[in-house]
Interface confidence: low
């Protein structure tokens, strides 16, 4: 495929990545799928600088990111190493709380109203952020 050199319409460029901020809500899996269909992924936060950028754009609203532990350990959707990477959890989070009465624990991470992260029930309909890297090969066929 051809290399993407600029961001799609309605996406925001920042530090060689493009970001799309939803204004509606979806369950985590649906948000994940939405981003994949856009040749992107749910946002992966790798630095304090990126955290501040995303936080500025989403405001004080619960918003899904590309971090989950549905198979056991916490994992970023793009394969970035969780254990050694940037983290911004609220104090005492993640806590895999079972007391919500919705069945199971909490396996998906979101930005909270103050920007710090919490784990929550993946079925909750939160806003989400998609991210795709510039300079990566897009899935579109090359122009002939």
């Amino acid at each position: 495929g051809s290399e993407r050199t600029c961001c799609p319409v309605n996406w925001v460029e920042h530090e060689r990545s493009c970001y799309w901020f939803s204004r509606s809500g979806k369950a985590w899996a649906d948000a994940d799928n939405y981003c994949r269909l856009e040749d992107a992924h749910l946002v992966v936060v790798t630095s304090w600088e990126e955290q501040k950028f995303v936080q500025h754009h989403i405001g004080p609203v619960n918003t899904w990111m590309g971090l989950h532990d549905q198979n056991g350990p916490w994992k970023w959707v793009d394969g970035t190493d969780y254990e050694t990477g940037f983290k911004n959890w609220r104090p005492e989070q993640p806590d895999d709380w079972y007391g919500h009465g919705l069945g199971g624990g909490e396996d998906c991470a979101h930005f909270t109203d103050d920007g710090r992260w919490n784990d929550d029930v993946c079925q909750r309909p939160y806003r989400w952020v998609c991210e795709t890297e510039l300079d990566k090969a897009s899935q579109e066929p090359p122009l002939l």
Partner: antibody, heavy 115, light 107 residues
Framework: EVQLVESGGGLVKPGGSLRLSCAAS????????LNWVRQAPGKGLEWVSS????????YYSDSVKGRFTISRDNAKNSLYLQMNSLRAEDTAVYYC????????WGQGTLVTVSS | DIQMTQSPSSLSASVGDRVTITCRAS??????LAWFQQKPGKAPKSLIY???SLQSGVPSKFSGSGSGTEFTLTISSLQPEDFATYYC?????????FGGGTKVEIK
């Protein structure tokens, strides 16, 4: 500098109990998974248990499930392993290690189960 | 459970040799693999995490490669301080599991 220091090991009879502690410093304790890993004399490494930052996610190996309990006190930067119904095969050096990729390890504490 | 099979279980090598240790996972673990070095009477030390990332402070003579089920640890030029036992470990899923270890001895 990241430091993990285990304590609480010793000699105990089969069926007895022991509580191991791991004191941590040099990092934001409450945001990291912590683990216990053990090594029997002359043998390889065996993962024992894992606990998430907020203590919501806890996992055990089948060999200790129902006998060992992992816990943490984030206010004290401490990790614990309560070991009950100890068996001879639990004899090992017990290490605490940070993250599921075990990026930092303590020096270990020896637990000997023998009559 | 994911089984980790390390080979060889031991090897003899000389100072300056290039040494390669292999680790095979019984199922796909992406790049969630770490390598450790352990010397007698000491705690293991992390060398590689999320293959091929080198742990901070570890010399570049150590390198990791692979993805999925096949991984290798390479020591480009063996030095006296590198004679030790090496373990691989997967953290893709619980239970976390180790390879059986590879003892690197002086020829």
């Amino acid at each position: 500098e990241v430091q993990l220091v285990e304590s609480g090991g010793g000699l105990v009879k089969p069926g007895g109990s022991l509580r191991l502690s791991c004191a941590a410093s040099g990092f934001t304790f409450s945001t990291y998974n912590l683990n216990w890993v053990r090594q029997a004399p002359g043998k390889g490494l065996e993962w024992v248990s894992s606990i998430s930052g907020g203590a919501g996610h806890i996992y055990y190996s089948d060999s200790v499930k129902g006998r060992f309990t992992i816990s943490r006190d984030n206010a004290k930067n401490s990790l614990y392993l309560q070991m009950n119904s100890l068996r001879a095969e639990d004899t090992a050096v017990y290490y605490c290690a940070r993250t599921n990729g075990f990026d930092f390890w303590g020096q270990g504490t020896l637990v000997t189960v023998s009559s | 459970d994911i089984q980790m099979t390390q080979s060889p279980s031991s090897l003899s090598a000389s100072v300056g040799d290039r040494v390669t240790i292999t680790c095979r996972a019984s199922q796909d673990i992406s790049n969630y693999l770490a390598w450790f070095q352990q010397k007698p009477g000491k705690a293991p030390k992390s060398l590689i995490y999320a293959t091929p990332s080198l742990q901070s402070g570890v010399p570049s003579k150590f390198s990791g490669s692979g993805s999925g089920t096949e991984f290798t640890l390479t020591i480009s030029s063996l030095q006296p301080e590198d004679f030790a036992t090496y373990y691989c470990q997967q953290y893709n899923s619980y239970p976390l599991t180790f390879g059986g270890g590879t003892k690197v001895e002086i020829k």
